[in-house]
Interface confidence: medium
């Protein structure tokens, strides 16, 4: 009578997965994009902006070619996930400025938690270690200010940006390799 | 050292207005957002209004709505309540906070306002 | 009314550790930070906790805050004659677009 309703599809085709995840980060980084051009708009950012408890870039041009599956799809995980309690600490600590932002921002993380969960099952139907490499976890502290917080908010965007950007190339590239 | 000093209250009567201020020094006014929160004689702390750190982003409590408005001068480090039809429930000392972000570091030491015929 | 429920009173002797309660919602405390503030008679409120649990400097560690839920508590140890005062639980509010605040806990050291 085939699987339960509400659980998971059984794939017999990674590629298919592949695409799923694609689709979805492809939907991500566009929201991303929209709301990073929301934020230059409300907020215009003087210069780029940074912030150390960001994961640094995982991809570039020169490392396209020696990409492998298992280690894009583990990094993709813990850099999202490090995105992830970024925005959450945005949409609480960020003070009334950042407020004006909602529910867009909500909207952000519930997507980047929807494509976390399809990562983890593209990863477990690979037969994948689920178990991310030994990382800091650099403690969120306060924003010095309300300026700080909009500052940490250009970073955390254009930070995810560049990595659904990359996440995107890189899947696609690995398709290939299927 | 971080300061903040409000002026302009006093007594007046109903549905009369009143325009307090908050003096900011100390730090880079133009980086935090700022707050007003209100205490009535024996009472608790009442939330009233905020305004973000470039002026443009305010938010009332449904109790001042449409009467009260906040609003800043960065030039002059200086922080705005305009209060227009006041009623007898608006009697309390006024306090202005600073935010970083979600908490107030600092307040001033307040100014009372009294409405009474 | 206010949102935030806290009880009235609390009361405790030197040296003893007392708990106050902060009852809320999902979209105040449930999705946002928690922030105490103690007020001395006769003084402005200060900044007693923030971040659910974290101190300013200047506040002794006897003071710490915690939070579960919908619910947050700030606790009191080794109590202290000194600490006789009105103590305030607040929130962002993401339904009223505001700060809320408890109604207030008056300590009464013994």
């Known amino acids: 009578p085939g699987p339960p309703a509400g659980s998971p599809r059984v794939s017999s085709d990674p590629r298919a997965d592949l695409d799923s995840a694609v689709l979805l980060t492809r939907s991500l980084l566009a929201d991303t994009r929209q709301l990073a051009a929301q934020m230059r708009d409300k907020f215009p950012a003087d210069g780029d902006h940074s912030l150390d408890s960001l994961p640094t870039l995982a991809m570039s041009a020169g490392t396209l070619g020696s990409l492998q599956l298992p280690g894009v799809l583990t990094r993709l995980r813990v850099d999202l996930m490090s995105y992830l309690r970024h925005v959450q600490w945005l949409r609480r600590a960020g003070g009334p400025s950042l407020k004006t932002l909602e529910p867009e921002l909500g909207a952000l993380q519930a997507r980047l938690e929807r494509l976390l969960r399809r990562l983890q099952l593209l990863m477990s139907r690979l037969a994948l270690p689920q178990a991310a490499p030994d990382q800091p976890v650099i403690p969120l502290g306060p924003p010095a200010s309300a300026w700080g917080s909009i500052r940490a908010a250009h970073a955390i965007l254009g930070g995810l940006h560049l990595t659904l950007d990359w996440a995107v190339r890189g899947l696609l590239l690995l398709k290939t390799r299927l | 050292e971080v300061q903040l000093v409000e002026s302009g209250g006093g007594v007046v009567q109903p549905g009369r207005s009143l325009r307090l201020s908050c003096a900011a020094s100390?730090?880079?006014?133009?980086?935090?957002?700022m707050h007003w929160v209100r205490q009535a004689p024996g009472k608790g702390l009442e939330w009233v209004a905020v305004?973000?750190?470039?002026?443009?982003?305010?938010f009332y409590a449904d109790s001042v709505k449409g009467r009260f408005t906040i609003s800043r001068d960065n030039s002059k480090n200086t922080l705005y309540l305009q209060m227009n039809s006041l009623r007898a429930e608006d009697t309390a000392v006024y306090y202005c906070a600073r935010t970083p972000g979600s908490h107030f570091d600092y307040w001033g030491q307040g100014t009372l306002v009294t409405v009474s015929s | 009314q206010s949102v935030l429920t806290q009880p009235p009173s609390a009361s405790g002797t030197p040296g003893q550790r007392v708990t106050i309660s902060c009852s809320g919602s999902?979209?105040?405390?449930?999705?946002?930070?928690v922030n105490w503030y103690q007020q001395l008679p006769g003084t402005a409120p200060k900044l007693l906790i923030y971040?659910?649990?974290l101190r300013p400097s200047g506040v002794p560690d006897r003071f710490s805050g915690s939070k579960s839920g919908t619910s947050a508590s700030l606790a009191i140890s080794g109590l202290r004659s000194e600490d006789e005062a009105d103590y305030y639980c607040a929130a962002w509010d993401d339904s009223l677009s505001g700060v809320v605040f408890g109604g207030g806990t008056k300590l009464t050291v013994l």
């Open positions: 971040y659910d649990d």
């Open positions: 999902s979209s105040n405390i449930g999705s946002n930070y």
């Open positions: 100390g730090f880079t006014f133009s980086h935090y957002d």
């Open positions: 305004i973000s750190y470039e002026g443009s982003n305010k």
